[in-house]
């Protein structure tokens, strides 16, 4: 039997059953999430669930830029340090950098400080690049 690899939307890349779209547009976290949803296919800001997934994404993004942080789908909606993925994925894999998570920083970004392999919390109103994800 021939198993066809699913195709992603133009400009998105495929990895292990998921499609990812990296957008070098400036959005606050909630606008970024709504834009991801607008692309259909059940897309959301990306959940990152393993080191392998993180490494693949980081390698891809590093081909475009190495200095701008990028919103991902991890947030703290109750503002109680109870982090959850916006797409409903289980929050098991963690890759926080050592930076403080205090103040009003209730949305997560991939940090450029460690080649996008670690996360930092940031203020959700900040305008930043963002990463979307869906399962084709």
């Amino acid at each position: 039997d021939i198993i066809m690899r699913p195709s992603c939307a133009p400009g998105w890349f495929y990895h292990k059953s998921n499609c990812y779209g990296y957008f070098r547009k400036l959005r606050n976290w909630s606008d970024a999430e709504l834009e991801c949803q607008s692309y259909g296919n059940g897309a959301h800001l990306a959940s990152i669930l393993s080191l392998k997934e993180a490494s693949t994404i980081a390698e891809y993004i590093s081909g475009y830029q190495r200095s701008q942080p990028i919103w991902i789908g991890l947030h703290d909606p109750q503002k109680r340090q109870q982090w959850q993925w916006i797409d409903g994925a289980m929050y098991l894999y963690r890759s926080w950098s050592g930076k403080s998570m205090g103040g009003n920083k209730h949305c997560a970004e991939m940090s450029s400080n460690n080649n996008f392999l670690t996360w930092s919390s940031n203020e959700c109103n900040k305008r930043q690049h963002f990463l979307c994800k869906y399962r084709p």
Epitope: K25, L26, N28, S30, L34, E35, E123, C124, N125, K126
Partner: antibody, heavy 118, light 109 residues
């Protein structure tokens, strides 16, 4: 209830630097996690975004004004400042400050008229 | 100005008036559109956010919509207090900044 009040000289000479201050009450700049923007409106004309500064100090500017505009925050005095260098008569306008949530402006200050004339 | 609006619009009380806002894929098509009302001699006030949402206190006579690179604001049941300038606005991805429309003066006849 957040309120914004612009202040500064109403008259500036050509080639000089326009300096305005926006005092924020009802919110703490250091804890609010917002951008704070400046928008201007020449008499009888439309609105033009000058730029916005995040409370931490990083700023975005209108490309057409980027070389002349500088926006900064003073979290101790709860103020946002605008400096516009090398002004001409075309910079005569009502200058507004507004809170910017990364998506839109709300609320706005009442505005202050700055006239550039010798 | 990157966003284009008609300079004026007028209608009699109780009628409906629609204001258009034309842009591009860099702003309106892939960004949210916002509308501001500026009553004579006052600062602008947010009227519509995220294309079609009304802040609390804004009557449901005001409605926003968007299709492709154009947006529109409709005012139904027009009243004399609606006489004002109306501006559309959006983030522009090519400029990395906000852009405003040229503004439309609404007159209630």
């Amino acid at each position: 209830q957040v309120q914004l009040q612009e202040s500064g000289p109403g008259l500036v000479k050509p080639s000089e630097t326009l300096s305005l201050t926006c005092t924020v009450s009802g919110d703490s700049l250091s804890r609010s996690s917002y951008y704070w923007g400046w928008i201007r409106q020449p008499p009888g004309k439309g609105l033009e975004w000058i730029g916005s500064v995040f409370y931490s100090g990083s700023a975005d500017y209108n490309p057409s004004l980027k070389s002349r505009a500088s926006i900064s925050v003073d979290t101790y005095q709860n103020q946002v400042s605008l400096k516009l260098t090398s002004v001409t008569a075309a910079d005569t306008a009502v200058y507004y400050c507004a809170r910017d949530d990364g998506s839109t402006f709300d609320p706005w200050g009442r505005g202050t008229l700055v006239t550039v004339s010798s | 100005y990157v966003l284009t609006q008609p300079p004026s619009a007028s209608e009699t009380p109780g009628q409906r008036v629609t204001i258009s806002c034309s842009g591009s894929s860099a702003n309106i098509e892939y960004n949210f559109v916002y509308w501001y009302q500026q009553l004579p001699g006052t600062a602008p006030k947010l009227l519509i956010y995220r294309n079609n949402q009304r802040p609390s206190g804004v009557p449901d006579r005001f409605s926003g919509s968007k299709s492709g690179t154009s947006a529109s604001l409709a005012i139904s049941g027009l009243r004399s207090e609606d006489e004002a300038d109306y501006y559309c606005a959006a983030w522009d991805d090519s400029l990395n900044g906000y852009v405003f429309g040229t503004g439309t003066k609404v007159t209630v006849l």
